[in-house]
Every structure is written in structure tokens, then in C-alpha cells.
């Protein structure tokens, strides 16, 4: 028996359902009574879901997993993982035993898009050219950790005097705060780009300083 899984990681958005694909080629005359199927976490071997003795033994993992019972006899051993969480990320092994055995691992990559950044300025009044200002770009509830880029109005990257911090909340999602300290010119636009490296999703925020008033 040969077990096949997708070589590319499965990317799943937080709170959505994901399917970890696994298949095998049944021999002629195969019946489900002959099948033993185990899904387990690759690193710890923690049991996730099992099928044995002709019966789905159910989820051993937060009661959020399911097989596709009608497709098992055709060799479809895929696992459905519901309401994906950050903590579900990792490698899952599909182990199939009939008169022979084989196993293969599939990676689950969890992702969550970042919110549109909000921009704040300090100080935010009586601004004059030559003043040092602090611009903060904040984006929320994303995963995994973001990449943050700053540019000026001409699209020139701003890399000096940038401090970025990322904090995970209780669900494992990140809030990102990036602070740019810059000396004001006569006027200017400062933009912040928050990129989710897995989703290749870019969230943009900008602030334009033209004396008074400020535009965000």
C-alpha cells in the first residue's frame, strides 16, 4: 500500500475548516474491515483521529476532526479539521495499515490576515519642518508574524529609526506596532505596509503631513 499526501503545505485561515489530503490505492476486494487508519501529530505522535475494525473511532483531538466515511473505501483517507486554530499548525502523519503499511506527513500552515493599519502621530499638532515626529502604524489579529515596511512619498524605503514589536494574544494572533521616528520635511507622505508572508497579503496605511491639517 502506498500513501500519498500533498507535498505543499496546506494553508488554512484561522476559524475556517481545512482538509489534510491523504490517499491510498486499495487492492481488489478491499473492505473497510481490513483498514486501520491513524492520523497523528508527526512530532509527538499524539493521536488525532483513527479508523479501525471497520469503524470510525472518532476524534481524539478537540473533537474537531472528521474523516470522509463514504470515500474511505475508494482510498480517500483525508482528514477534515474544523475551526482551525493557531495551535493546530504543524505536521500531521497519515498512517495506513492493511496487509501492508505506509505513512506520509502533510504540513498545516495556519494564517490570518492583518487588519488595515491605523496610523497615529506624536506630537499631532503644531508641526513644523525640522520637527522630530513619531509615526505609529498598528495592525491587528494576524498570523504568522508580519513583515513591516516603511516608505516615503517617493516610494523610497525608510529603514532607519524603525522599531517594530509584535505581541501574540490569547488566541496566538499577532498585533503589530511599528514606530517610525522621522524629521519632518516641508510636507510629506509616510506609508506603512504590513505583509502577511504566508498569505502574501499586504495591508497599507499612510499619513500625509502638509502643515495643517494632517490627513490619514
Amino acid at each position: 500500500v502506498e500513501v500519498q499526501v500533498s507535498e505543499d503545505p496546506v494553508v488554512a485561515l484561522v476559524d475556517t475548516d481545512a482538509t489534510l489530503r491523504c490517499s491510498f490505492s486499495p487492492e481488489p476486494g478491499f473492505s473497510l474491515a481490513q483498514l486501520n487508519l491513524i492520523w497523528q501529530l508527526t512530532d509527538t505522535k499524539q493521536l488525532v483521529h483513527s479508523f479501525t475494525e471497520g469503524r470510525d473511532q472518532g476524534s481524539a483531538y478537540s473533537n474537531r476532526t472528521a474523516l470522509f466515511p463514504d470515500l474511505l473505501v475508494q482510498g480517500n483517507a483525508s482528514l477534515r479539521l474544523q475551526r482551525v486554530r493557531v495551535t493546530d499548525e504543524g505536521s500531521y502523519t497519515c498512517f495506513v495499515s492493511i496487509q501492508d503499511f505506509d505513512s506520509a506527513a502533510v504540513s498545516l500552515q495556519v494564517a490570518a490576515p492583518y487588519s488595515k493599519p491605523s496610523m497615529t502621530l506624536e506630537p499631532n499638532k503644531d508641526l513644523r519642518p525640522g520637527n522630530m515626529v513619531t509615526i505609529t502604524c498598528s495592525s491587528y489579529q494576524g498570523y504568522p508574524e508580519a513583515e513591516v515596511f516603511w516608505k516615503d512619498g517617493q516610494g523610497v524605503p525608510l529603514t532607519g529609526n524603525v522599531t517594530t514589536s509584535q505581541m501574540a494574544n490569547e488566541r496566538g494572533l499577532f498585533d503589530v506596532h511599528s514606530v517610525l521616528r522621522v524629521v519632518l520635511g516641508a510636507n510629506g507622505t509616510y506609508s506603512c505596509l504590513v505583509r502577511n508572508p504566508v498569505l502574501q497579503q499586504d495591508a497599507h496605511g499612510s499619513v500625509t503631513i502638509t502643515g495643517q491639517p494632517l490627513t490619514f
Epitope: V1, E2, E27, A33, Q34, N36, I38, Q40, K45, Q46, L47, S50, T52, E53, Q57, A60, F95, S97, I98, Q99, D100, F101, D102, S103
Partner: antibody, heavy 118, light 110 residues
């Protein structure tokens, strides 16, 4: 008739090596996983290792991991167990067995005796 | 020390019914099938029960197996003198990816 015939056992000193063979007949050898199971004198059965039909997957008991290697030659319908760094506690009758549904072992050889002693 | 627990011995008189127990855990018997082997004196083991309750062809229906939770049992009814042997339960341990045997039960027919 399905048959398994082990060979290669014998007396070996501690730290020595031995290679066991198991010749299979009467079934499509490459379609089945195969095990080695041992039994020390007067003791119970002790699982040693397993290999899948195409030889790409293996598992070992902790007690032999890193010292024993299970392999197979499907063109010769033969299973092997290479045993290195042998210890006195490896003394046993070694059986090769055929993989069966639901993790069972449905055919057993007659066994070959390995004695590790100085 | 065996991962699966069996009584070291059991006995019965001819015609009697004898039961041998096998206790495991959630990751072996609780997750997968139990198989039973009979080893007559001086011979190789023989598969007696697979998939917890199935008999291979040639095994008399006096032998039956059952499983509940993390325990299993082998029942032999109408005990005969030729049933005197060692009996082993076995399973696959999903937490270790290894096969595990019970310590064996020596059955004596009185």
C-alpha cells in the same frame, strides 16, 4: 502453501554482528509487510522490527534501535535482520512473520536461535 | 516488562470455559485491534484471533475474542487437553508506532 524459513542464527560474542535471513514462498512477497519477533529462553514474545512491502518504511523496538536494521530484497523474496553490537540480552529465538490485516501476524517461521555469549 | 498485561497463568478442566484477559491503554488496545496468538510447547506461535474477534480459517469456533475500551479477552469453551499452551495478546501502539505483546498466559488443562 505460505512458508517462511529463517536462517543465519548462531553463537556470537558480545559486541559482534550477525545477519539473519528469512526466505518466503507461497505468496506475493512484495505486497506484504514483514516483522521480526524474538523470544528469549523461557520468556514471552518480544517485537523487534517491521518493514513495509516496498521497503520504504521501517519501525523498531527501542531496545534494538540504532543496532539492528531490517531490510528486504523483493526480487529474492527474502527478509533480513542485520544485528550489530549484540548483547547477552539479545539471546533469543528470532521469528520472521508476515504482516496481516489489523496489525496481526498470520504466518510465522520456525525460528532461528541467536546466542550471544563470551 | 510488557506493555499489555495478562495473568501469568490460567487453568481449567476439560469441557470447561476459560477466559484470559488482556489490559492495555488508550493508545494501543483503545485505538487499534487486539490479536491473540497460541504457542504450543516447542513450536512457533500461531495466529488465533485477529481484529479483536475474528478467527482465521482453521481455528475452531471454541475460541472467541472480544474487546471493550482498553481491555480485551480471549474465551476458550469446551476446553480440550490440546489447548494447553501459552497465549499472548498483541496490539499496535499508536503513541510509539510499535507492536506490543502481553507477557503471556500459561494455560493448564487439569
Amino acid at each position: 502453501e505460505v512458508q517462511l524459513l529463517e536462517s543465519g542464527g548462531g553463537l556470537v560474542e558480545p559486541g559482534g554482528s550477525l545477519r539473519l535471513s528469512c526466505a518466503a514462498s507461497g505468496f506475493s512477497f512484495s505486497s506484504y509487510g514483514m516483522h521480526w519477533v524474538r523470544q528469549a529462553p523461557g520468556k514471552g514474545l518480544d517485537w523487534v522490527a517491521v518493514i513495509n512491502g516496498e521497503g520504504s518504511g521501517t519501525y523498531y523496538a527501542d531496545s534494538v534501535k540504532g543496532r539492528f536494521t531490517i531490510s528486504r530484497d523483493n526480487s529474492k523474496s527474502t527478509l533480513y535482520l542485520q544485528m550489530n553490537s549484540l548483547r547477552a540480552e539479545d539471546t533469543a529465538v528470532y521469528y520472521c512473520t508476515k504482516y496481516y490485516y489489523n496489525y496481526a501476524m498470520d504466518v510465522w517461521g520456525q525460528g532461528t536461535t541467536v546466542t550471544v555469549s563470551s | 516488562q510488557s506493555v499489555l498485561t495478562q495473568p501469568p497463568s490460567a487453568s481449567g478442566t476439560p469441557g470447561q470455559r476459560v477466559t484470559i484477559s488482556c489490559s492495555g491503554s488508550r493508545t494501543d488496545i483503545g485505538t487499534t485491534s487486539v490479536n491473540w496468538y497460541q504457542q504450543l510447547p516447542g513450536t512457533a506461535p500461531k495466529l488465533l484471533i485477529y481484529q479483536s474477534h475474528q478467527r482465521p480459517s482453521g481455528v475452531p469456533d471454541r475460541f472467541s475474542g472480544s474487546k471493550s475500551g482498553t481491555s480485551a479477552s480471549l474465551a476458550i469453551s469446551g476446553l480440550q487437553s490440546e489447548d494447553e499452551a501459552d497465549y499472548y495478546c498483541a496490539s499496535w501502539d499508536a503513541s510509539q508506532n510499535t507492536w506490543v505483546f502481553g507477557g503471556g498466559t500459561k494455560l493448564t488443562v487439569l
